[in-house]
């Protein structure tokens, strides 16, 4: 079915809000543990599917709304399930700037959508 | 505590439109999204879409995308949900709602606002 | 979309017993699974949020399990009070799904 997104975000926004939660912080989410993941393996699914878990945390909800609305493109955003490093967990913050530095990467060189 | 209070019942003609609105209070109107949901009588809860408030960004359900609005007056913390081409189809209670706790699961609702269409 | 599949449609029980109820979706949901209870007349109160977290005030007789597709709500010790409709919503994926509805009510 075409997609619910309208008009869905961009990796633009993205970056920016993802620039917006983590600037000038230490921690997020008073410091909560998230699985590790391959954001490789179609990054925006890769990032909600690990993000998902994390409740009562404001600072980060419209993080997990962008990434959810581009999860949910089909077939752009990639819903190949990721790999979880289950053996591997890391702060919010962590998660979110490797998210911030990927993201970056892919936008600068317009491998994208 | 968080309060959504929704405009009264509307009895509209097909083909017309509605506009329903939301007041909220007891939180930062711009720190989360609301969310619309309606159910038609005696049926289950069908999901519309979501504003956020902060940036006027919306989320729709590709069934409603051509017909309806979603809206939000920060100066009043009023959210409003506007459908048009009205039909008998549209009989419904329409609820807002906010979520707090946990990203996209509604936990506190308006008390909803029964739509009529009728000629 | 995801499908959410909900069943017993209805379910008539015994007060002091347990009730289940299952959800079964389209597709993966991770964690993504809530689920709502809803009296005649009111609007719908969230109970449980992430498959297994109750809200506060939400009692422990409550309990949500499962993972991937498959999901279960359980009331233990069933009630009066604990008639109406159960709705399980996925929030993994936009739209956002509900399951039909499980209709609990008291022999």
């Known amino acids: 079915s075409p997609s619910p997104v309208t008009p869905s975000p961009t990796l633009k926004e993205l970056i920016e809000e993802l620039v917006n939660i983590t600037q000038n912080q230490a921690s997020l989410c008073n410091g909560s543990m998230v699985w590790s993941v391959n954001l490789t393996a179609g990054m925006y699914c890769a990032a909600l599917e690990s993000l998902i878990n994390v409740s009562d945390c404001s600072a980060i909800q419209r993080t997990q709304r962008m990434l959810k609305a581009l999860c949910s493109q089909k077939p752009a955003a990639g819903q190949i399930s990721s790999e979880r490093s289950r053996d591997t967990k890391i702060e919010v913050i962590q998660l979110v700037k490797n998210l911030l530095t990927y993201v970056r990467g892919v936008y600068r060189h317009g491998n994208f959508r | 505590e968080v309060q959504l209070v929704q405009s009264g019942a509307e009895v509209v003609k097909p083909g017309a439109s509605v506009k329903v609105s939301c007041k909220t209070s007891g939180y930062s109107f711009t720190d989360y999204p609301i969310y619309w949901v309606r159910q038609a009588p005696g049926a289950g809860l069908e999901w519309i879409g979501y504003?956020?408030?902060?940036?006027?960004?919306?989320t729709y359900n590709q069934n409603f995308k051509d017909r309806v609005t979603l809206t939000a007056d920060k100066s009043t913390s009023t959210a409003y949900m506007e459908l048009s081409s009205l039909r008998a189809g549209d009989i419904a209670v329409y609820y807002c709602?906010?979520?707090?706790?946990?990203?996209?699961?509604?936990?506190?609702w308006g008390q909803g606002t029964l739509v009529t269409v009728s000629s | 979309d995801i499908v959410m599949t909900q069943t017993p449609l209805s379910l008539s029980v015994s007060p002091g017993e347990t009730a289940s109820i299952s959800c079964k979706a389209s597709?993966?949901?991770?964690?993504?699974l809530a689920w709502f209870r809803q009296k005649p007349g009111q609007s719908p109160q969230a109970l449980i949020y992430?498959?297994?977290n109750r809200y506060p005030g939400v009692p422990d007789r409550f309990s949500g399990s499962g993972s991937g597709t498959d999901f279960t709500l359980r009331i233990s010790r069933v009630e009066a009070e604990d008639t109406g409709v159960y709705y399980c919503l996925q929030h993994w994926q936009y739209p956002l799904t509900f399951g039909a509805g499980t209709k609990v009510e008291l022999k």
């Open positions: 992430l498959v297994s």
């Open positions: 504003i956020d408030p902060y940036n006027g960004g919306t």
């Open positions: 597709q993966n949901l991770r964690n993504a």
């Open positions: 709602a906010t979520a707090v706790v946990a990203t996209d699961v509604m936990e506190n």
